[in-house]
């Protein structure tokens, strides 16, 4: 028996993945549920099995094709259904029409690397992953640097208001260990949100030259 307040939230990674989370107060943990995707103008449909991620929350990824294939466009509408097994039949729990390019969340940036490091500055580059060519240059980035003795939450956010896949960090302390993260967001979409943060890149600034002021 499934009742109570439910919530169904999905995001499109701009290429071939729709990730969904369904939560239901009072749902049984062992309830078998799935998400079914029916695009309005495609010949394919797709299903994924919702797996528990917390006490009353389930998640799954609709894999629409090869990771870099462009499976949906700005004119597509996908009807998403949550179905849960009740005895021998499936019961529809939620129905949502979903415009993929209004609900974007890209993959985290990858391939972070230190291009050049000095005593007080460091140049870092990265790449975006599985991002649609439709965006052209209409992307923005946020970056943050973890300093010794601080937390990620305390790190100030650096905003790059254009598609710039590098940054020059300045006013760093010599011979100090830092970590760096970046995330990306398209400019379009009613519910578009930031990607997850990239894996942290650790780097160390060069020591100050002996006999010189720091």
């Amino acid at each position: 028996a499934v009742n109570g307040t439910s919530q169904f939230t999905c995001f499109y990674n701009s290429r071939a993945n729709i990730s969904c989370v369904w939560s239901q107060d009072g749902a049984l943990q062992d309830t078998s549920c799935q998400v079914h995707a029916w695009p309005d103008r495609r010949r394919w449909n797709q299903t994924c099995e919702l797996l528990p991620v917390s006490q009353a929350s389930w998640a799954c990824n609709l894999i629409l094709g090869a990771p870099d294939s462009q499976k949906l466009t700005t004119v597509d509408i996908v009807t998403l259904r949550v179905l849960c097994r009740e005895g021998v039949r499936w019961r529809v729990m939620a129905i949502q029409d979903f415009k993929p390019f209004e609900n974007l969340r890209l993959m985290a940036p990858i391939s972070l690397q230190v291009v050049h490091v000095e005593t007080h500055r460091c140049n870092i580059s990265w790449e975006i992953s599985q991002a649609s060519h439709y965006f052209e240059r209409h992307l923005e980035f946020e970056a943050r640097t973890l300093s010794p003795g601080h937390t990620w939450e305390e790190a100030p956010l650096l905003t790059l208001k254009q598609k710039q896949e590098w940054i020059c960090l300045e006013t760093l302390t010599p011979d100090t260990q830092y970590e760096f993260q970046v995330r990306v967001k398209p400019l379009q979409g009613e519910f578009t949100t930031w990607s997850p943060w990239s894996q942290p890149l650790a780097f160390r600034t060069k020591p100050a030259a002996l006999g010189k002021d720091t």
Epitope: Q7, D97, K99, E190, F191
Partner: nanobody
């Protein structure tokens, strides 16, 4: 304040289709989430569909069985409800409603979440 006027209702044979419209005036239409509700004779008003301010997400009552389609055109200040394969049990007064507070289209809203209502349009399905 936004005013809503529904149109497109009427008498239809079972199996037919109908397109309902709801025209808004007197406010910034794109600032409102929009919903459709219906009330059959002797029954409570029930949720049919709700769409977000930009139309990026639209939730449907599970009872709609994929026969209903809700869309909006912010340039025309209008929200639509297309009903296919009509059944006698679809007979009801259909109401358009607007919601001032934010709605993200991830859950089923209650009728009390909507603060502006149209006068309704009658849909009668004959068998």
């Amino acid at each position: 304040q936004l005013q809503l006027v529904e149109s497109g209702g009427g008498l239809v044979q079972a199996g037919g289709s109908l397109a309902l419209s709801c025209a808004a005036s007197g406010g910034t239409f794109s600032s409102y989430a929009m919903g459709w509700f219906r009330q059959a004779p002797g029954k409570e008003r029930e949720f049919v569909a709700a769409t977000t301010r930009g139309g990026g997400r639209t939730m449907y009552a599970v009872s709609t069985e994929g026969r209903f389609s809700c869309s909006r055109d912010n340039a025309k200040n209008t929200v639509y409800l297309l009903i296919k394969n009509l059944k006698p049990e679809d007979t009801a007064v259909y109401y358009c409603a607007a919601r001032t507070s934010y709605y993200d289209g991830t859950y089923y809203p209650a009728s009390s979440d909507f603060d502006i209502w149209g006068q309704g349009t009658q849909v009668t399905v004959s068998s």
